[in-house]
Interface confidence: medium
């Protein structure tokens, strides 16, 4: 069983104040106003930011823009109609789409990734769709903290 | 839906619900937010079926305690039943514990629509027999 216990932190529009995440043997703790799911914590913004602004906001909270393990990772919000910035960008050096931690995008995650404009950033809809947009466009964003 | 409400308000059921939760744990595949656990259903049910489905999970049909929670839930899921109903259009909207629900519910003047649904950041009335996605909640 996963479990998540509340920490009484109240953020304003950004993901929240810096906080060391607490772990115990059977509990994952997420900050107030973050969502806990499968022992990950997610901050789902309702405010629109550029990709870089989003990346910095997540980083300032000891988290990163969403890195997807698989397309059902955000199963709990698969009926959402919004698109969100995720932590995927094109590396000229590696000529590949990379996540923020440097790992490469699996070709199975977004079969259409070859059509993405490499100058753009990637916005993701939790039902599994992704599209490339100018990084200067403003979108909602999702931060992720992996607890295990 | 009044007969089901009486069953839902039965104190032994409430006790069982409380005993099923311990150590602040959420069941697998549920999400947590602000000290509550949520089951985000994908199945469509009538309002009464949804009530029973949540009861079988030792939880309650989605209740919305404040507008911050409503905004969060609207991000997660554009539409779902909530635990607010009325016996007829001549009766007030009430929550599962029988308290009057004071916030605006759209289309309330339609006598056919006596169960409430959260729909894209808005509370609306709907036919209780409609098949709509449901979510369950329990407080930690």
């Amino acid at each position: 069983k996963n479990s998540f216990t509340k920490l009484s932190i109240e953020p304003a529009f950004t993901p929240g104040p810096n906080i060391e995440l607490q772990k115990d043997s059977d509990c994952c703790s997420c900050q107030e106003k973050w969502v806990g799911y499968r022992c990950n914590c997610y901050f789902i913004s309702s405010e629109q930011k550029t990709w870089n602004e989003s990346r910095h906001l997540c980083a300032s909270q000891k988290s990163s823009l969403l890195q997807l393990q698989n397309t059902d990772e955000l199963d709990f919000m698969s009926s959402s109609q919004q698109f969100y910035w995720i932590g995927l960008s094109y590396s000229e050096e590696h000529t590949a789409w990379l996540w923020e931690n440097g790992s490469a995008l699996s070709q199975y995650l977004f079969p259409s990734f070859e059509t993405f404009n490499t100058k753009n950033c990637i916005a993701y809809n939790p039902n599994g769709n992704a599209l490339d947009e100018s990084c200067e466009d403003k979108n909602r964003y999702i931060c992720k903290q992996q607890l295990i | 839906p009044s007969t089901l409400i009486q069953r839902h308000n039965n104190s032994s059921l409430n006790t069982r619900t409380q005993k099923a939760r311990h150590c602040g744990h959420c069941p697998e595949e549920w999400i947590t937010y602000s000290n509550s656990c949520y089951y985000i259903g994908k199945e469509r049910r009538t309002w009464e079926e949804s009530l029973l489905a949540c009861t079988s999970k030792n939880s309650s049909l989605l209740s919305i305690d404040n507008e911050e929670e409503m905004k969060f839930l609207s991000i997660i899921s554009p539409s779902s039943w909530i635990g607010v109903f009325r016996n007829s259009s001549h009766h007030p909207w009430v929550t599962m514990n029988g308290l009057a629900f004071k916030h605006e519910i759209k289309d309330s003047d339609n006598a056919e629509l006596n169960c409430a649904v959260l729909q894209v950041n808005r509370l609306k009335s709907a036919q209780c027999g409609s098949s709509i996605i449901y979510h369950c909640k329990h407080k930690l």
Epitope: E10, F13, R140 | M70, V120
Partner: antibody, heavy 118, light 107 residues
Framework: EVQLVESGGGLVKPGGSLRLSCAAS????????MNWVRQAPGKGLEWVSA????????YYADSVKGRFTISRDNAKNSLYLQMNSLRAEDTAVYYC???????????WGQGILVTVSS | AIQLTQSPSSLSASVGDRVTITCRAS??????LAWYQQKPGKAPKLLIY???SLKSGVPSRFSGSGSGTDFTLTISSLQPEDFATYYC?????????FGQGTRLEIK
Amino acid sequence: EVQLVESGGGLVKPGGSLRLSCAASGFTFSSHSMNWVRQAPGKGLEWVSAISSSSSYIYYADSVKGRFTISRDNAKNSLYLQMNSLRAEDTAVYYCAREEWGLPFDYWGQGILVTVSS
Amino acid sequence: AIQLTQSPSSLSASVGDRVTITCRASQGIQSALAWYQQKPGKAPKLLIYDASSLKSGVPSRFSGSGSGTDFTLTISSLQPEDFATYYCQQFNSYPLTFGQGTRLEIK
């Protein structure tokens, strides 16, 4: 009857500060998000800031971010806007407005004039 | 930020006319759009929310339609008290934004 009454406006020099207040009555203030909206003379409406019912969520327009601070005191049924580093372009009538559980602004105050001029 | 473009910016009409004002969003906002009426020296007044829902107490000659990016406010038969400025507003995402306004004048 729902009432929102703004106060605290006036003339201030560029770089100066002002604190606006909005006194609410006739509804359960602590259940509602509140907003500030402004309107420069002869211009359209511009949303300034929002604060959720228990202050957990706060939002600002880019034009005021870092200079203005929204806050509320639910015990006093009051909403505030602290405005620092004021500029000429902040000159406007400032309105406070109520949200009804995600509905747009269903009640507005009468507005208060803020003039930033040397 | 989501930009809202209203058209026309101003229009002249007569009592009894049917009037349509449009509002276009720079990106999809589902049905999260409101319409307000403002008279000189007064605060705005909410007319329509959710793109098409009439606020209680607002005359039924006002109606709204649309979803996604294109929205319309219609006044079916203009009354003398309807001459004012009308604004659309999106509340899909922060920052919230208003259209630039449409001034409705007596012909």
